[in-house]
Interface confidence: low
């Protein structure tokens, strides 16, 4: 029906306005409505002007799209001619009454389809449905992928490219790790990737001044060390150093009136020479205190060494050995006096005997045919040595003795001359002063070590060697090496050390093979006035450990490898050190500070006597331990 109407209208237009000229009223009759008429008539007049004979010929040829008046007039009512829609964006144009409708292609909008729709910003279809990049284009869009991804067949989703699989050698000797859109060349901790060489290179952390004192770089890492022998330990940050602090203060008060007999590990503490009238006889009186069971209290001899007298302790009892031109004697007697109490001892030469008294009670009377020391030129010249004797005497003794004696004497009176002159000598020398109060035990002051030679080989055992150790300890600082076995090549195949724990006011015990901690007993309260007990047993197959709170048979993957290292060292020769380490590199063990505190050690069933050590630092007390410092109301 519409098309019939259009055809009718077209016919009327031809007749009324092309074959003849029409005015506006006549045009109104053709269109039968004002909007179309108002739209048509001005344009009709333009057509007439254009096609009047002879007028604007040049212009018509160049600018007018219509060849004649008919075409020009017929085109006026068609709103879609010339095309008002955007050519790129329209799909069709529909003519209306003095209007037109552009139908847009997908992706375009606007009255004339002149505006591109940005599908990438469509809230109902986020990012155009693309998984990564949405590219808007005129009238359309497309999805694309970031570097390192490829588009899937659905043209929307992206898939990661696994560069590590595509090019296995992409990272060289480093490990290739695929990551979304890329890859990384990974190195172990402590290594850095070198792009040029395509390999992992060790980071030298020591060149970056990571450590406060000593730094040892190794492939993949570094370790900081502090000089334990100077009283430093590694701080919790594992980089800086801090002072090894006292956790249990001890009463280290000394008195110069008390002479310490163990000032020297080897050697005499005091040497005196007497020149007295020939009627003088030997006499010595003193108070004596010790927990030691054997050692020399004093040795006296004539000026020509022909006669001598030894006052010593053996098995805790007084022993006298004497030798002169008339006789050679050895006598032991009296009660045990190594009880830590002050005992009054007197040795007096009488006319026919030597009398030994303890607490003024005679315990021995030794007969002698003549004077002990022979006077010469009207004088009795005598040399007296405290806590030792000249080296050559050792071979002359009637019965050998270990001269070392950890004890104290006070109130001495030699040759009836009182203490004159001696006190003045002692007063000046702090290390000759004795502690006011001591307890049973051995004391390591944190400044030195003792060395023993112990044969750990057990022929009867299938293991070949074993180390069974019992430690009774009362540490005064929370860090230090208690026991170490040291090889000839300056390595430490086994050590037992103390370190301050990360948890407050407690300590850990470390067992180490060389510089590796093979076991750590954590958070023990060892800094107390009570002794703590620790046992461990080690052979080439096992490591067992016992504390009052924990029993462990230690087993982890690495242990057998570490025990193999220890086994190798034990088959060679090891020296046993108590209280610290000899001069080995800082890096030889996890701890290198000296142990400070009391400690008694039993190895393979034998209680170690520090007097029997091959060497011992003078400050280590073999048989006495300072008491715990008690706060008094005044202090």
């Amino acid at each position: 029906a519409n098309s019939l109407l259009e055809e009718t209208k077209q016919g009327n237009l031809e007749r009324e306005c092309i074959e003849e000229l029409c005015n506006k009223e006549e045009a109104r009759e053709v269109f039968e409505n004002d909007p179309e008429t108002d739209y048509f008539y001005p344009k009709y007049l333009v057509c007439l002007r254009s096609f009047q004979t002879g007028l604007f010929t040049a212009a018509r040829q160049s600018t007018n799209a219509y060849p004649d008046l008919r075409s020009c007039v017929n085109a006026i009512p068609d709103q879609c001619s010339p095309l008002p829609c955007n050519e790129d964006g329209y799909m069709s144009c529909k003519d209306g009454k003095a209007s037109f409708t552009c139908t847009c292609k997908p992706g375009w909008q606007g009255e004339k389809c002149e505006f591109d729709i940005n599908e990438c910003k469509d809230p109902s279809n986020i990012n155009g449905g693309c998984s990564q990049i949405c590219d808007n284009t005129p009238g359309s869009y497309h999805c694309s992928c970031k570097n390192g991804f490829v588009m899937l067949s659905n043209k929307k989703d992206c898939k990661d490219v696994d560069e590590c699989s595509l090019k296995p050698s992409i990272c060289g000797t480093a490990v290739c790790k695929n990551i979304p859109g890329d890859f990384e060349c990974e190195c172990p901790e402590g290594y850095r990737y070198n792009l040029k060489s395509k390999s992992c290179e060790d980071i030298d952390e020591c060149s970056e001044n990571m450590c406060a004192q000593l730094c040892v770089n190794y492939p993949g890492g570094y370790t900081c060390y502090c000089d334990g022998k100077k009283g430093f330990k590694l701080a919790q940050d594992q980089k800086s150093c801090e002072v090894v602090s006292v956790c249990l203060p001890l009463n280290l008060d000394t008195k110069y009136e008390l002479l310490y007999l163990a000032e020297q590990f080897a050697g005499v503490v005091l040497y005196l020479k007497f020149r007295l009238p020939e009627i003088s006889r030997f006499s010595a009186e003193f108070d004596f205190r010790t927990y030691d069971s054997e050692g020399v209290i004093l040795y006296a001899e004539s000026i020509d060494h022909s006669a001598w007298l030894l006052i010593a302790l053996r098995g805790g009892k007084i022993e006298v050995q004497l030798k002169n031109e008339h006789t050679s004697k050895i006598t032991t007697g009296g009660d045990v006096i190594n009880n830590g109490l002050w005992n009054m001892v007197s040795v007096e030469e009488l006319e026919h005997s030597i009398s030994i008294k303890i607490a003024k009670e005679a315990v021995m009377d030794i007969n002698k045919p003549g004077p002990l020391f022979k006077p010469e030129n009207g004088l009795l010249e005598t040399k007296v040595y405290f806590a030792g004797f000249p080296r050559k005497v050792e071979s002359e003794l009637i019965k050998p003795i270990n001269p070392r004696l950890d004890g104290c004497i006070r109130s001495w009176n030699l040759m009836k001359q009182g203490a004159s002159g001696i006190k003045e000598i002692i007063q000046e020398k702090q290390n000759k002063h004795c502690l006011v109060t001591v307890e049973k035990g051995s004391y390591y002051p944190g400044s030195g070590i003792a060395q023993f030679h112990i044969d750990y080989n057990n022929v009867s055992s299938a293991e070949g060697w074993h180390v069974n150790v019992t430690l009774n300890i009362r540490p005064s600082t929370g860090t230090g090496v208690m026991l170490a076995l040291v090889s000839g090549n300056n390595t430490v195949p086994f050590a037992v050390s103390l370190v301050d724990s990360t948890s407050e006011k407690s300590q850990d015990i470390l067992l180490s093979v060389e510089n590796t901690v093979i076991y750590r007993i954590q958070a023990l309260s060892l800094c107390s006035d009570q002794q703590s007990h620790l046992e461990f047993r080690v052979n080439r197959n096992n490591l067992e450990l016992s504390t009052p709170l924990k029993i462990e048979t230690i087993s982890h993957e690495d242990l057998q490898r570490q025990l193999a290292v220890l086994d190798k060292a034990m088959k060679a020769k090891v020296a046993t050190y108590l209280g610290g380490l000899p001069d080995v590199p800082f890096s030889a063990t996890p701890v290198n500070a000296f142990y400070n505190g009391c400690m008694e050690v039993n190895i393979n069933g034998v209680q170690l006597d520090l007097d029997e050590a091959i060497s011992k630092h003078n400050d280590i007390r073999a048989h006495s331990c300072p008491s715990v410092w008690k706060k008094t109301k005044n202090s």
Epitope: E544, L549, K550, I551, N602, Q607
Partner: antibody, heavy 122, light 108 residues
């Protein structure tokens, strides 16, 4: 063959002290490789280790935190025994009390006493 | 302290069957420091297994133990009538030494 024989009263008044003794035969209380323990059992608490004593060149004690402030375990070397003293008892302490040997260094219990039912009641 | 949890609380089986008892620790008990005990009414506990898997002297080989760290199992391969009683696990790796609450094995 190790045997442990327990003795002691079966009834104790609240706030008083519970005392039990364990006599050892076939082993020594001073054995360097053993620990001598007390364990109790009650329906509410089940089996509960109380503590032990052991000799390693000197005597040591080891107590459970729950009773530490009021327990004493002592060796009696002259009689080859060890004893338990639990002070300030309450009805909560009513249980069967066992003495037991901890083998070697380890605190698993290979020999047990016959058990003593101790009732805390006024 | 280390808490030991035994499961199941009660296990009902017939003679000749296989029993599997479980013991779980709240933290690692070290190198297999776990023991199993059997307790019959009116008697003291009797040691069956120590070190998680080592049978005590005189214990029949139908009893076996396994596990390490935090998970342990006692297995009785063929139940005999005398096996129907209560079983306890105990850790001795660290003080205080603790026991499980027990598993009762009863005849179905």
């Amino acid at each position: 063959q190790v045997q442990l024989q327990q003795s002691g009263p079966g009834l104790v008044k609240p706030s008083q002290t519970l005392s039990l003794t364990c006599a050892i035969s076939g082993d020594s209380v001073s054995n360097n490789n053993a620990a001598w323990n007390w364990i109790r059992q009650s329906p509410s608490r089940g089996l509960e280790w109380l503590g032990g004593t052991y000799y390693r060149s000197k005597w040591y004690n080891d107590y459970a935190v729950s009773v530490k402030s009021r327990i004493i375990i002592n060796p009696v070397t002259s009689k080859n025994q060890f004893s338990l003293q639990l002070n300030s008892v309450t009805p909560e302490d009513t249980a069967v009390y066992y003495c037991a040997r901890g083998s070697s260094w380890y605190r698993f219990f290979d020999y047990w006493g016959q058990g003593t039912l101790v009732t805390v009641s006024s | 302290e280390i808490v030991l949890t035994q499961s199941p609380g009660t296990l009902s089986l017939s003679p000749g069957e296989r029993a599997t008892l479980s013991c779980r620790a709240s933290q690692s008990v070290g190198s297999s420091y776990l023991a199993w005990y059997q307790q019959k009414p009116g008697q003291a506990p009797r040691l069956l297994i120590s070190g998680a898997s080592g049978r005590a002297t005189g214990i029949p080989d139908r009893f076996s133990g396994s596990g390490s760290g935090t998970d342990f199992t006692l297995t009785i391969s063929r139940l005999e009538p005398e096996d129907f009683t209560v079983y306890y696990c105990q850790q001795y790796g660290s003080s205080p030494y603790t026991f499980g609450q027990g598993t009762k094995l009863e005849i179905k």
